[in-house]
């Protein structure tokens, strides 16, 4: 014998009050898949939350964060403040990038400048808080005589802090 | 799989204590520090405190020191929040989180898995 609740599609559930009779959810309230005995209620988006996308019958409200923060956690279940370049969040707080490092983002870590001299570089351009340095041509590339064409080095992730 | 449980929050009256305990499953309990977090309705996440895999070493941030204990029972796979004299400012939603290496401390979030949150009302 099929169960007559299996008939109720998604928006609806089946009321067994009302002899199983499907009935629409409630507002603020949704189901997003057949036969269902009971509607969830629809996630609110309030505070440091904002709705990005309305609740309907059929699927819930989806929420992001308020500008000065960023989602955490699946389907955004948080919002973690935002810092400003050249910071990083620790667990008291935005703090400026230790020397010898840099933030470029408003969010994520500190990181190492590139160390220059592991591919035989020289610093062209000073790193600060908020950009890494940038490596220039090696001396060798500077003596009279060499070719004026080097081949690039290969990219590599931001090394040690320059002895 | 690895997950997080949160569990014991509820309404309680200004002044009063609630636990907080969060399960754990799917990775090696004792190996990781465990962090509390919180999520206060207006604002963002808030470090509350964090306990090294052996819980020898324990760190608390200054808005919760001396109210709140946190501790673990690596046998029973478990993480503990002990909060007395509650104030309004402590309602909020509470996250455990697993961290990324067995120490941990102070500064760097070192999070890889969040619980899905209990919430703790404080009511005057």
């Known amino acids: 014998l099929q169960d007559p609740c299996s008939n109720c599609p998604a928006g609806t559930f089946c009321d067994n009050n009302r002899n199983q009779i499907c009935s629409p959810c409630p507002p603020n309230s949704f189901s997003s898949a057949g036969g269902q005995r009971t509607c969830d209620i629809c996630r609110q988006c309030k505070g440091v939350f904002r709705t990005r996308k309305e609740c309907s019958s059929t699927s819930n409200a989806e929420c992001d964060c308020t500008p000065g923060f960023h989602c955490l956690g699946a389907g955004c279940s948080m919002c973690e403040q935002d810092c400003k370049q050249g910071q990083e969040l620790t667990k008291k707080g935005c703090k400026d990038c230790c020397f010898g490092t840099f933030n470029d983002q408003k969010r994520g870590i500190c990181r190492p400048w590139t160390n220059c001299s592991l591919d035989g570089k020289s610093v062209l351009v000073n790193g600060t808080k908020e950009r890494d340095v940038v490596c220039g041509p090696s001396p060798a590339d500077l003596s009279p005589g060499a070719s004026s064409v080097t081949p690039p080095a290969p990219a590599r992730e931001p090394g040690h802090s320059p002895q | 799989e690895v997950q997080l449980l949160e569990s014991g929050g509820g309404l309680v009256q200004l002044g009063g204590s609630l636990r907080l305990s969060c399960a754990a499953s799917g990775f090696t309990f004792s190996s990781y520090a465990m962090t509390w977090v919180r999520q206060a309705p207006e604002k963002g996440l808030e470090w509350v405190s964090s306990?090294?895999?052996?819980?020898?070493?324990?760190y608390y941030a200054d808005s919760v020191k001396g109210r709140f204990t946190i501790s673990r029972d690596n046998s029973k796979n478990t993480l503990y929040l002990q909060m007395n004299s509650l104030r309004a400012e402590d309602t909020a939603v509470y996250y455990c989180?697993?961290?990324?290496?067995?120490?941990?401390?102070?500064?760097?979030?070192?999070?890889?898995?969040w619980g899905q949150g209990t919430t703790v009302t404080v009511s005057s």
């Open positions: 989180a697993k961290e990324r290496t067995g120490t941990t401390g102070d500064y760097y979030y070192n999070v890889d898995v």
């Open positions: 306990i090294s895999g052996s819980g020898g070493n324990t």
